[in-house]
């Protein structure tokens, strides 16, 4: 087991999963294409906590970056031993592992909040609410609520594909950054087995 | 004061069309949403649906799909409910209502009379 | 479509005293129920939304509550004005069905 390539895997995967956390993030402040609703303050309050943006964005980059440059060569060695250095850096992403699962898991929850909430809109009675908050989420199952919403067009469709998707790129960097303290510990203790002759792919 | 002008009253031959307007004045919310209504002679009240006049977004009772069709036009402020292959089941008074910050207001009826 | 049922159909009552209609709905519909009040020969009047949020304009002796199945309309001192039919409406997913009124006369 190479624990510095799997670590390069994970920083890369992380890299990809953040970027489309921002993207998924951003495109709930405009629903259906308009500002409007961003400019009048009708979005959904779980949509200000930026946990695409900040949790599982730009938060996620930090412990990505130090992943990917887990796997390179110029590592001093410490009292006469070259792996001393790897092994110190490998326990140390562990570190930078346990930041992402705090981001991935803001993101986790605001998402899965935001999806149980459901978003702001003005329904069919003129008025702004949280048209399903009553419903502890069973709206999520019942599809012909949605045309409570009169406006946004199509807001519930938006706010539950975002949110769902937030939820689970969350999810899967949950599940990376956890893989990376196992392999961080066992390749700090183990050792940083990899020579320059061996390859492995991600 | 908000007020909702509907147009008057109409006789109609079986099997014709009618549209129905519905004027809103004096609005200071600039999202409100339209519904339309349907009372027989001394009976109860029935939803046919709504239009948000800003989004296009429509909704319409299932059984009133092929009968109501609704429309909006945003720059003179008119919801229009288009009725066709009336019938004399179709003969009622037609409400416009419409909702907006906590305040929903009625229009006066239009009453339609499907007739030979 | 979901049945809304009010009860009684028609009742009498003196001003000054309270006054309660039922309105039971076939499903839970949460909270999703609007109140509405039409005199004779006049356009209905919106009066409640939200099983309990008082409609702009509309005086607080009235009050709505309930929820899930379950729902009544409060007139807590019956004044003359307050005569006509009363219409419960669920506004919980489409169509937005009525129920079939009470008929409120003053004594």
């Known amino acids: 087991m190479c624990y510095g390539k799997c670590a390069r895997c994970i920083g890369h995967s992380l890299v990809g999963l953040a970027l489309l956390c921002i993207i998924a993030n951003i495109l709930l402040y405009f629903p259906n294409g308009e500002t409007k609703y961003a400019s009048e303050n009708h979005l959904s309050r779980f949509v200000w906590f930026f946990s695409g943006i900040v949790g599982g964005g730009l938060l996620m980059l930090l412990p990505a970056f130090v992943f990917i440059g887990l796997e390179q060569d110029d590592c001093c060695g410490c009292c006469g031993h070259e792996n001393c250095g790897k092994r110190c850096a490998m326990l140390s992403s562990v570190l930078a592992a346990l930041i992402g699962i705090a981001g991935s898991g803001y993101c986790v929850i605001v998402a899965a909040l935001g999806l149980a909430e459901g978003p702001l809109c003005l329904d069919s009675f003129g008025q702004w609410n949280y048209t399903f908050a009553s419903t502890e989420g069973q709206y999520l199952l019942d599809t012909s609520t949605w045309s409570q919403c009169t406006e946004p067009k199509h807001i519930v469709e938006w706010n539950v594909s975002l949110f769902s998707i937030l939820l689970a790129l969350g999810g899967i960097e949950f599940i990376l950054c956890l893989i990376q303290v196992i392999n961080g510990v066992l390749g700090g203790i183990c050792g940083f087995c990899c020579s320059r002759q061996q390859q492995y792919d991600c | 004061e908000v007020q909702l002008q509907q147009s008057g009253p109409e006789l109609v031959k079986p099997g014709a069309s009618v549209k129905l307007s519905c004027k809103a004045s004096g609005y200071t919310v600039t999202s409100y949403v339209m519904h339309w209504v349907k009372q027989k002679p001394g009976q109860g009240l029935e939803w046919i649906g709504y239009?948000?006049?800003?989004?296009?977004?429509?909704n319409c009772n299932e059984k009133f799909k092929g009968k109501a069709t609704l429309t909006s036009d945003k720059t003179s402020s008119t919801a229009y409910m288009e009725l066709s292959s009336l019938t004399s089941e179709d003969s009622a008074v037609y409400y416009c209502?419409?909702?907006?910050?906590?305040?929903?207001?009625w229009g006066q009826g239009t009453l339609v009379t499907v007739s030979a | 479509d979901i049945q809304m049922t009010q009860s009684p159909a028609s009742l009498s009552a003196s001003v000054g005293e309270p006054v309660t209609i039922t309105c039971r709905a076939s499903?839970?519909?949460?909270?999703?129920l609007a109140w509405y009040h039409q005199k004779q020969g006049k356009s209905p009047q919106f009066l409640v939304y939200n099983a309990r949020t008082l409609a702009g304009g509309v005086p607080s002796r009235l009050s709505g509550s309930g929820s899930v199945t379950q729902f009544s309309l409060n007139i807590n001192t019956l004044h003359r004005e307050d005569l006509g039919t009363y219409f419960c409406?669920?506004?919980?997913?489409?169509?937005?069905?009525f129920g079939g009124g009470t008929n409120l006369e003053i004594k």
């Open positions: 239009i948000n006049p800003y989004s296009d977004v429509t």
């Open positions: 409406q669920h506004h919980y997913d489409t169509p937005y069905t």
């Open positions: 209502s419409s909702y907006g910050g906590g305040f929903a207001y």
């Open positions: 499903k839970n519909i949460y909270t999703y």
